[in-house]
Every structure is written in C-alpha cells, then in structure tokens.
C-alpha cells in the first residue's frame, strides 16, 4: 500500500530493533555431534530484536498486522523479527555409506524483517 | 536435518499454538478509508499463537533457533508464528486518474509456521 510506509530507523534506540546477530554454537549445542563432522563450531546469524510500528515491515500483511496490533493488542500480535533471506552453509556429515557434503540453504540467516 | 523433527501437535492445549485466525477489520481500522473503495470490510487471516519447541518449524533455521532458545533464552528468541503462504485479495482503490482494481498477493495469510 502506498499509504503505510515501512521505516528503517529504530525508535527504541541502537540495537533494540529487529537486526541480524551472530550466535556461536557448537555441534553439541545443536545436538548434531553424532552426525555432523565439520565444521565443529557454527556461526549462526539469527534475527533478534523488537518490531515497533512499521519498522522493517516485510510486506502489506505485516503493515496491517502492526496497525491492528495497535488497535487490538490482545487479539493481534505485533510483527516479529524473522529471516528475510538466508546464506548457504556446507556441512560434512555421516551417512549410511560413509561421509557426504551437503549444502543447507535455510540454516543461516542473511537478512531480517518484521513479519 | 534428519535429526530434528518438526511436530504438528500442540503441547500447550487447543488453540494455544501457532495457527490461522480470522480478524474482521474495516477500512477505518486500517486507515485505508481515504483510498480503498471496496471491499469496505476485510477478513484478514492472521497468524497467532505460540511456537513451543519444534512446533511447525518453518525450516532448519527455525529448528536450531528453537534448540538455541532452550539453551540461551535471553540471547536467542523463540521462533514466532508468521505466514507461510498468502491468498490474494482484490481491492478497488482511488488513483490519480480515477478508480482501479489491484490484486494484493501478500495481504491475507493462508498458512502459518514457526520461523
């Protein structure tokens, strides 16, 4: 809609709004140590932070969700910070026949928005 | 990942987990009454509810997000309930040159998952 404009400046202060953050995780953290062989530590970019009114709205649905949350906060949740895109990562893992490399296209977030 | 399975049964009880809900909204509610002419009331399906561990996980990222949230709840947020797909809706609206019909493909949610 031309009548609701998403905004990119965070009204809550630096680092408070929806953004990408890197989280270090071991294979043990993920419960993957029995089948993933490498890498043994992953840098997992994740989407964190709040989604104040109209901030980084993903689409028209998110814009109206923000609007209706303002009117009916108990009924309609605020938009939340989720990945808008991913970056691929290759894992080496154990298979029945040995070892293989597999690319995961949906594991590490590359960008975030409010949906 | 073959080692983390999303689940579809809600451990929190009926209606508590991520699901689609219809919210009635007027053009006035949306602040659209000055430019949208019809329909004057919209049925806006929205995604509401909680995302307990592994419930309706959108992808590998959501699965590991759920896992890491269990380990570092202050650092990593739980997955949240967002649209997985949309259904189109046609709006008649005012334009500079008169009236036009436009299909919005991202306004009404059709399915939900935890991302």
């Amino acid at each position: 809609s031309a009548h609701l404009h998403p905004r990119d400046s965070c009204p809550l202060g630096p680092g408070r709004c929806c953004h990408l953050e890197t989280v270090q995780a071991t294979l043990e953290d993920l419960g993957w140590s029995d089948w993933v062989l490498s890498p043994r530590q992953l840098q997992l970019s994740m989407c964190v932070g709040e989604c104040p009114h109209l901030y980084r709205s993903a689409n028209t649905h998110a814009l109206i969700k923000a609007r209706l949350h303002g009117l009916q906060p108990d009924r309609v949740p605020a938009p939340c910070c989720v990945p808008s895109s991913y970056t691929p990562v290759v894992l080496m893992h154990r298979t029945d026949s040995g070892v293989s490399l597999q690319t995961y296209d949906d594991l590490v977030a590359q960008g975030c928005h409010c949906a | 990942s073959a080692h983390l399975h999303p689940r579809d049964s809600c451990p929190l009880g009926p209606g508590r987990c991520c699901h689609l809900e219809t919210v009635q909204a007027t053009l006035e509610d949306l602040g659209w009454s000055d430019w949208v002419l019809s329909p004057r009331q919209l049925q806006l399906s929205m995604c509401v509810g909680e995302c307990p561990h592994l419930y309706r996980s959108a992808n590998t990222h959501a699965l590991i997000k759920a896992r890491l949230h269990g380990l570092q709840p202050d650092r990593v947020p739980a997955p949240c309930c967002v649209p997985s797909s949309y259904t189109p809706v046609v709006l008649m609206h005012r334009t500079d040159s008169g009236v036009s019909l436009q299909t919005y493909d991202d306004l009404v949610a059709q399915g939900c998952h935890c991302a």
Epitope: - | L37, Q43, T87, P88, V90, L101, V108, A109
Partner: antibody, heavy 118, light 112 residues
C-alpha cells in the same frame, strides 16, 4: 478470461435442501469476492449473500439468514450456496458472480434453475 | 433495507436515438469517500446479467462508450447515446452501500 461455471438444474421437494456449485474455470477466484443472487421467473434480481477472501465467513441478507450457507473451497476454486427448508417461492434461477466486495459484479455464472415442487 | 426504484418500467427505443433510464434510492448512496455505491447491469434475453457501470459513473471494462452513468445521492441516470439493436434487455441498478445489496425492479428496453 475466468468463467464461472455453475452446476445443473435441480428439482426439489418442499422442505428439502439444494446445494449449487460455482467453479472458476480457466483460473481461480484470484482474490475476488463471490456473491449469490437469484431471479424468480419473470422477476428481478435478489441478492442472497456473499463471501470475500479468505472465504472464511459469509455475509447474508437477513431474509435468508438461517436458511442459506455460502462457502468456498480455494483448493478447487469452487463456491457453494446451500438453501434449506425449500418452499415453492424459492423456485428461481440462482446466479453466482464475482465482485470486489459486493460491488462490481463483472463475471457471472450461467445460472442454475432450481424448481421446488411437490 | 435501501429500496431502489427504476423508471420507466418499459422503454421502447429507436435504433440510433438516445435513451435514458432513471434510478432512485430510498437513502443516499454517497459514501463519505465521495463515491456513489451504485452499479448498472444489463440482462440480455436468455443471458446472465452483465456489468455496465460501477460506482455511479465508471464504465466497466469492454463496455462501449455510448453507455454513461451519472447522478449522486439518491438520483441516478443511465444514458445510451445511440441505441443499437444489441442493447435490448432489462437494465437494473444496484446499490452496494449497505447490505443487503438491493436491485431496482428493472427497465425493459425494446426496439420500437
């Protein structure tokens, strides 16, 4: 160009129900609302109700409230109008039409003749 | 319910001549957004209705420019600048301001 194709003519007994279907051929409902209207023999048009995306709840004319149910199945691009407790006055041609809300009914089905007779 | 009244009931016309149909509503169809929630439909013999005009004065896609709609509030007019043989049928006005949607009784246009 989308066409709305309705189910065939029906002959029903008083007190029974009829369910008329309306399928979008050559496409889907594509985000349009679906209205239902009827036309008794030699008479004008009468609006019964309608349903807008996501086709969850319908809006009915008070006259038919409790007797009519309008539904739509997006997966098959088919809308339905069910009228219960039929009486002879319900004998009419029933039409579905797509619109933007209840306005701008730009594509109509060919009509379904429903005859109520004992 | 909003009552829609059309006149005349029947309109004999000569091809090439203009024709005019009136539609009155029992309450104003002018919305606060400045648009009149009134459509005009033509039902040709043995056919389903077809949309001619929406929102009082907007011609629907594919409708010849000899058809025009005018009026505001409670008084509306459909004009055919030069009637053609294919224009015969019953013309209906319809209000979409509030449910139930209501139609006028119809005006039958026939060739003299």
């Amino acid at each position: 160009q989308v066409q709305l194709v309705q189910s065939g003519a029906e002959v029903k007994k008083p007190g029974s129900s009829v369910k008329v279907s309306c399928k979008a051929s050559g496409g889907t409902f594509q985000g349009y609302a679906i209205s239902w209207a009827r036309q008794a023999p030699g008479q004008g048009l009468e609006w019964m109700g309608g349903i807008i995306p996501p086709y969850a709840t319908a809006n009915y004319a008070q006259k038919f409230q409790g007797r009519v149910t309008i539904t739509a199945d997006e997966s098959t691009s088919t809308a339905y109008m069910e009228l219960s407790s039929l009486r002879s006055e319900d004998t009419a041609v029933y039409y579905c039409a797509r619109g933007v809300g209840e306005l701008h009914l730009d594509v109509w089905g060919q009509g379904t003749m429903v005859t109520v007779s004992s | 319910d909003i009552v829609m009244t059309q006149s005349p009931l029947s309109l004999p016309v000569t091809p090439g001549e203009p024709a005019s149909i009136s539609c009155r509503s029992s309450q104003s169809l002018l919305h606060s957004n400045g648009y009149n929630y009134l459509d005009w439909y033509l039902q040709k013999p043995g056919q389903s209705p077809q949309l001619l005009i929406y929102l009082g004065s907007n011609r629907a896609s594919g409708v010849p420019d000899r058809f025009s709609g005018s009026g505001s509030g409670t008084d509306f007019t459909l004009k055919i600048s030069r009637v053609e043989a294919e224009d015969v049928g019953v013309y209906y006005c319809m209000q979409a301001l509030q449910t139930p949607i209501t139609f006028g009784g119809g005006t039958k246009v026939e060739i003299k």
